[in-house]
Amino acid sequence: DAEFRHDSGYEVHHQKLVFFAEDVGSNKGAIIGLMVGGVVIA
């Protein structure tokens, strides 16, 4: 049987990807990170 029409079963969340560089002073240079939805993931 063919499927009846329904939307995908999951919701797509559109989030900003923010790259940032943070100066850590005289230690090891800078930390480069990727923030997704407010959480640093890399």
Epitope: E3, F4, G9, Y10
Partner: antibody, heavy 123, light 112 residues
Framework: QVTLKESGPALVKPTQTLTLTCTFS??????????VGWIRQPPGKALEWLAH???????SYNPSLKSRLTISKDTSKNQVVLTMTNMDPVDTATYYC???????????????WGQGTTVTVSS | DVVMTQSPLSLPVTPGEPASISCRSS???????????LEWYLQKPGQSPQLLIY???NRFSGVPDRFSGSGSGTDFTLKISRVEAEDVGVYYC?????????FGQGTKLEIK
């Protein structure tokens, strides 16, 4: 508020074509995800799904009746029309229209129904 | 076509007592999007069907919390925790995952 109302002939003769109109208010068939379908119920029997039409004019039919059914919409009039050809006494039933809306924030079920219109097929 | 089989077909219940209706599908009604589109409708005497439960277990707005739906795969259940006089009518399950959409035969709930 959302309302739907079916209209059409109360009596049709065998072999004739039935034309039913569902006139609705409180929503628009131009809204993304919106759809209206037809369901019938012979006297004292269970419900049977007939057809459905979506806002983008996509249509779905019951395969067992597909050759006899045509569903269409007039968005400007807030109407959905169902035609059924070659009517037979076994098609005697109450015919309902109902709305259904796709979408992750929608119910995606037949949440509002019309009152139904009774059609008798007899010579 | 998917055959929906309800039991019992007749259900006499004493007010205040619980009631349970079974609905079985002849094949899986799991949609490719991961949802199971199993709905319950109540048709009160002389009225149009009205939505009670959608996607197996979600109560429609305004439906009393004494109504609950459960199940998966091919086996589904509608439960009424405490039956009231206004609950009389015919209950239908319907699968809307596959074409054609198919209804059960209906279960007539009556008050003892």
């Amino acid at each position: 508020q959302v309302t739907l109302k079916e209209s059409g002939p109360a009596l049709v003769k065998p072999t004739q074509t039935l034309t039913l109109t569902c006139t609705f208010s409180g929503f628009s068939l131009s809204t993304s995800g919106m759809g209206v379908g037809w369901i019938r119920q012979p006297p004292g029997k269970a419900l049977e799904w007939l057809a459905h039409i979506w806002w983008d004019d996509d249509k779905s039919y019951n395969p067992s009746l597909k050759s006899r059914l045509t569903i269409s919409k007039d968005t400007s009039k807030n109407q959905v029309v169902l035609t059924m050809t070659n009517m037979d006494p076994v098609d005697t039933a109450t015919y309902y229209c109902a709305r259904r809306q796709l979408g992750l924030r929608s119910i995606d079920a037949m949440d509002y129904w019309g009152q139904g219109t009774t059609v008798t097929v007899s010579s | 076509d998917v055959v929906m089989t309800q039991s019992p077909l007749s259900l006499p219940v004493t007010p205040g007592e619980p009631a349970s209706i079974s609905c079985r599908s002849s094949q899986s009604i799991l949609h490719s999007n991961g949802n199971t589109y199993l709905e319950w409708y109540l048709q009160k005497p002389g009225q149009s069907p009205q939505l009670l439960i959608y996607k197996v277990s979600n109560r429609f707005s305004g439906v009393p919390d004494r109504f609950s739906g459960s199940g998966s795969g091919t086996d589904f259940t509608l439960k009424i925790s405490r039956v009231e006089a206004e609950d009389v009518g015919v209950y239908y399950c319907v699968q809307t995952s596959l074409v054609p959409l198919t209804f059960g035969q209906g279960t007539k709930l009556e008050i003892k």
